[in-house]
Amino acid sequence: QPNNSLMLQTSKENHALASSSLCMDEKQITQNYSKVLAEVNTSWPVKMATNAVLCCPPIALRNLIIITWEIILRGQPSCTKAYKKETNETKETNCTDERITWVSRPDQNSDLQIRTVAITHDGYYRCIMVTPDGNFHRGYHLQVLVTPEVTLFQNRNRTAVCKAVAGKPAAHISWIPEGDCATKQEYWSNGTVTVKSTCHWEVHNVSTVTCHVSHLTGNKSLYIELLPVPGAKKSAK
């Protein structure tokens, strides 16, 4: 539906259940350990409602003694998932989220998967691999991204309101043309932010205004034709 002067405009991106992974391919397993140690921690933005696969350092499984995944989520006790090669046993401590699992049997694949990432999966994930040559770590600061819902409407003559609702992180709103604007942010307990920009255009030759919302999950633009100034009947341009 095209944008217009009175109808509420909404936009919500639909995510097919995509998968994202930072795993190295098998060729990189042969790289030396110093390369692994240099890449201890990674910040990783992941879209909500996608699948994520987190990987351990690329060390051949035959060299392993123990693999441990340590998961620290906000407001929860630290969860550990461990696999001991010698006894072929797995152990979990304080792990309650059934969506966070080994990709397959840990003796075959040390990767961790999160099925249908949620806001609650924001946190720190660390794989610790104990080998005869020492311990090797790889950590992920997982940042869950939430696409904001975008709306644009007019509430007064030549004043428009653009909202980016419940985004994570906060979206940025800009306008074409620039107006006399005020922007407010509202923070929600789940970590999302609503950004509201209210603008007024005094210049009478401005016909249509465009709200542009920039966000890590993608950008969105909506436009709306401004209502006439009250009492204005005729003007030559």
């Epitope: 095209p2 944008n3 217009n4 043309p177 205004v209 465009t210 436009y223």
Partner: antibody
């Protein structure tokens, strides 16, 4: 689905006036600006002006100021564009458009000839 | 008034080729625009709204990009039925203004 149905072709003599109509359906007529655009044979597109049916507010391009009159009949959801003092260079297809230019009528051919 | 400079004014391209048309707004003034296709005897047909939004039912070989004052319309792989004249329209300021058009013919 917005539909704009325009009146039929007209042949006029120089100095006469023509009134083209555009009947809208499929949306709230009084909530959307109605624009008028014309296209002379083999030429580009030219904006004439617009009218807001909810209030009757109008903007005309200065090129047409004094010769063009835009009106609406909200009871029939119809917009009108009248052009007076016609000359041969006003021979063109006249289009109405709404929804921020995303919905167009099929056009009305106005021929000005002596 | 905002002038829209559209280029090229005409081009002749082979089927399967990539076509790029540009529109630039005068005065360095940021605007928003639509892209239209017009075939002889027909009303302009909206292809791209708001600079980059592909309209329903329009083939995905058509795309629009750009922001501010510089905009690009692209046909990724030209088809015989794409022979037409293409126009940009800025709708941010009154008067609305069109580019002068690009006549696209098939070699």
């Amino acid at each position: 689905q917005v539909q704009l149905v325009q009146s039929g072709a007209e042949v006029k003599k120089p100095g006469a006036s023509v009134k083209v109509s555009c009947k809208a359906s499929g949306h709230t007529f009084t909530s959307y600006w109605m624009h008028w655009v014309r296209q002379a044979p083999g030429q580009g597109l030219e904006w004439i002006g617009n009218i807001y049916p909810g209030s009757g507010s109008i903007n005309y391009d200065e090129k047409f100021q004094g010769r063009v009159t835009m009106t609406v009949d909200t009871s029939t959801s119809t917009a009108y564009m009248e052009l007076s003092s016609l000359r041969s260079e006003d021979t063109a297809v006249y289009y109405c458009l709404t929804m921020t230019g995303t919905s167009w009528g099929r056009g009305t051919l106005v021929t000005v000839s002596s | 008034d905002i002038q829209m400079t559209q280029s090229p004014s005409s081009l002749s391209v082979s089927v399967g080729d990539r076509v790029t048309i540009t529109c630039q707004a005068s005065q360095g003034t940021p605007i928003n625009l639509h892209w239209f296709q017009q075939k002889p005897g027909k009303a302009p047909k909206l292809l791209i709204s708001g600079a980059s939004n592909l309209e329903d039912g329009v083939p995905s070989r058509f795309s629009g990009s750009g922001s501010g004052t510089e905009f690009t319309f692209t046909i990724s792989s030209l088809q015989p039925e794409d022979a037409a004249t293409y126009y940009c329209l800025q709708f941010t300021y009154i008067p609305w203004t069109f580019g002068q058009g690009t006549k696209l013919e098939i070699k």
